[in-house]
């Protein structure tokens, strides 16, 4: 049996199929590679993108964000906040864009503090450290390819392969390894 | 174009292909579905399984584990400990097994404390909560299927589809929503 991502012409047997520009909608991955059952939109780093972009659009018309600063946690703000805001190692999500990857846009977590929030004071303490938690995500990667066997890339033609990438999904508060 | 996971005989066009027992090595997914480029072993919940099983085997010949208790990391242990042990919302990994899933074995994180470790006292405090961080992982799911079109499952025959499942990857320490 042959890898479903490697279905090509007989002469490219066992190598990624090279798709022409005509076969690729807007330069993205061919629909049959985006396995219908996979429901990519369910993946958290994908699902978060639209809400992040909407929030970013609102903020541009609102006030500038101080999201990259380590916040002061106030008890009254905790009641409605999400995990990433209630955490004493809080994080924000950044949209990471890669034109040669599917999904092209993924939400990456970024710790907002080097230390953690001391719950007694609501302020950052250096006695603890915020560290990212990484997870693996399966993505499709595209590369230019040759359709005529010459080895020279054919304009607009791409081959696709799968790979796991490390995606930061949140932050946890740890005792520092060394001072 | 057709979904690579849906490549079947003409009469099953657009539905998952039904594989016979002979086509399936030891009842697992057909090799060509386990996309060569995907390198499943790189996925963290997969990669952790072998080390966890080895550690579990060692522990059975060693002393019983108190891994489900909320631990306190000793100051001298902080220097060499891993993130899941140094976290003030520590967790352990449990091997989750599902015969009808590929990968069949995945490492799921489980918080060891209901609260978090107070970095001042070294004791668990209920003033904070440990919560799991969930991530999506793409897996293959198998279901019994019919090879003769009767609708009755053919013994040993399976169809496969992809789905995202939520995998707990670690724990973070949060201010509780309500006091």
């Amino acid at each position: 049996h042959q890898d479903p991502f490697l279905r090509g012409h007989p002469h490219t047997h066992g190598t990624p199929r090279c798709y022409s520009a005509e076969e690729l909608p807007l330069g993205q991955a061919p629909p049959h590679l985006l396995a219908r059952g996979a429901k990519w939109g369910q993946a958290l780093p994908v699902a978060l993108v639209s809400s992040l972009e909407a929030a970013g659009h609102r903020r541009r018309h609102d006030r500038p964000s101080a999201a990259t600063q380590c916040p002061v946690l106030r008890p009254e703000e905790v009641l409605e906040a999400d995990t990433h805001q209630r955490s004493i190692s809080p994080w924000r999500y950044r949209v990471d864009t890669d034109e040669d990857r599917y999904p092209q846009k993924l939400a990456f977590a970024e710790c907002l503090c080097r230390g953690c929030i001391d719950p007694r004071t609501g302020r950052e303490t250096a006695a603890l450290n915020s560290v990212r938690l990484l997870q693996s995500l399966l993505v499709l990667r595209r590369r230019p390819c040759s359709r005529d066997g010459s080895g020279l890339p054919t304009p607009g033609a791409f081959a696709f392969h799968t790979e796991f990438i490390r995606v930061p999904v949140g932050c946890t508060c740890v005792l520092p390894r060394s001072v | 174009h057709q979904d690579p996971f849906l490549r079947g005989h003409p009469h099953t066009h657009g539905t998952p292909r039904c594989y016979s027992a002979e086509e399936l090595p030891l009842g697992q997914a057909p090799p060509h579905l386990l996309a060569r480029g995907a390198k499943w072993g790189q996925a963290l919940p997969v990669a952790l399984v072998s080390s966890l099983e080895a550690a579990g085997h060692r522990r059975r010949h060693d002393r019983p584990s108190a891994a489900t208790q909320c631990p306190v990391l000793r100051p001298e242990e902080v220097l060499e400990a891993d993130t899941h042990q140094r976290s003030i919302s520590p967790w352990r990994y449990r091997v989750d097994t599902d015969e009808d899933r590929y990968p069949q074995k995945l490492a799921f994180a489980e918080c060891l404390c209901r609260g978090c470790i107070d970095p001042r006292t070294g004791r668990e405090t209920a003033a904070l909560n440990s919560v799991r961080l969930l991530q999506s992982l793409l897996v293959l799911r198998r279901r019994p299927c019919s090879r003769d079109g009767s609708g009755l499952p053919t013994p040993g025959a399976f169809a496969f589809h992809t789905e995202f499942i939520r995998v707990p990857v670690g724990c973070t320490c949060v201010l509780p929503r309500s006091v």
């Epitope: 250096a126 | 220097l79 001042r120 070294g122």
Partner: antibody, heavy 120, light 112 residues
């Protein structure tokens, strides 16, 4: 007010034993890790040992391991250091000190110290 | 031998500022801003002056401040006063062998 008071120091011959005590008041003693720290005459500070808040965990500097034993009685708000096989180089003022973070050398409350002299 | 290196002595006149350095390695002082500083008057117990590199416990004068650059932590005393004359020690976490380490100490002399 918050305080630690050491006692039990004195003159002892090499190879002898001594038991130091540290009485705590003004704070919840059972919530804190406590350390013993010593200072030889005219020298700097040297960390000796810690004990966890519950007393279940102890740790010692290499220089005293196997000779000194730290213990506590939370019901009596008291800390102890049993010193055996004493050597001349153990001569020092011994301080008990409270750790403000259990895993860091932030000693926010100190006793006044008790002098231990090991001499023949 | 101390893992943290301090100058044996520093001096300054009343009203001046002085700085005491505490040099470690990239794996101790350099990694995190977690050095603490202690003041010790002759015949007295040490007193915590700075923790987490730059924080002052309540009751400590704001003339005392801490900072870090690279592998060196520093204690700065501004507006020097006669009562600041004392020994000063920095402290850090060490290794499994010596869990907590102190610098060798610096004798501060206030001139005049």
């Amino acid at each position: 007010q918050v305080q630690l008071v050491e006692s039990g120091g004195g003159l002892v011959k090499p190879g002898g034993s001594l038991r130091l005590s540290c009485a705590a008041s003004g704070f919840t003693f059972s919530d804190h890790y406590i350390s013993w720290i010593r200072q030889a005459p005219g020298k700097g500070l040297e960390w000796v040992s810690y004990i966890s808040s519950s007393g279940s965990t102890t740790y010692y500097a290499e220089s005293v391991k196997g000779r000194f034993t730290i213990s506590r009685d939370n019901a009596k708000n008291s800390l102890y250091l049993q010193m055996n096989s004493l050597r001349a180089e153990d001569t020092a003022v011994y301080y008990c000190a409270r750790q403000s973070y259990y895993f860091l050398p932030y000693f926010d409350v100190w006793g006044q110290g008790t002098l231990v002299t090991v001499s023949s | 031998q101390s893992a943290l290196t301090q100058p044996a002595s520093v001096s300054g006149s009343p009203g001046q500022s002085i700085t005491i350095s505490c040099t470690g390695t990239s794996s101790d002082v350099g990694s995190y801003n977690l050095v603490s500083w202690y003041q010790q008057h002759p015949g007295k117990a040490p007193k915590l002056m700075i923790y987490e590199g730059s924080k002052r416990p309540s009751g400590v004068s704001n003339r005392f401040s801490g900072s870090k650059s690279g592998n060196t932590a520093s204690l700065t005393i501004s507006g020097l006063q006669a009562e600041d004359e004392a020994d000063y020690y920095c402290a850090s976490r060490g290794s499994r062998r010596v869990l907590y380490v102190f610098g060798g100490g610096t004798k501060l002399t206030v001139l005049g």
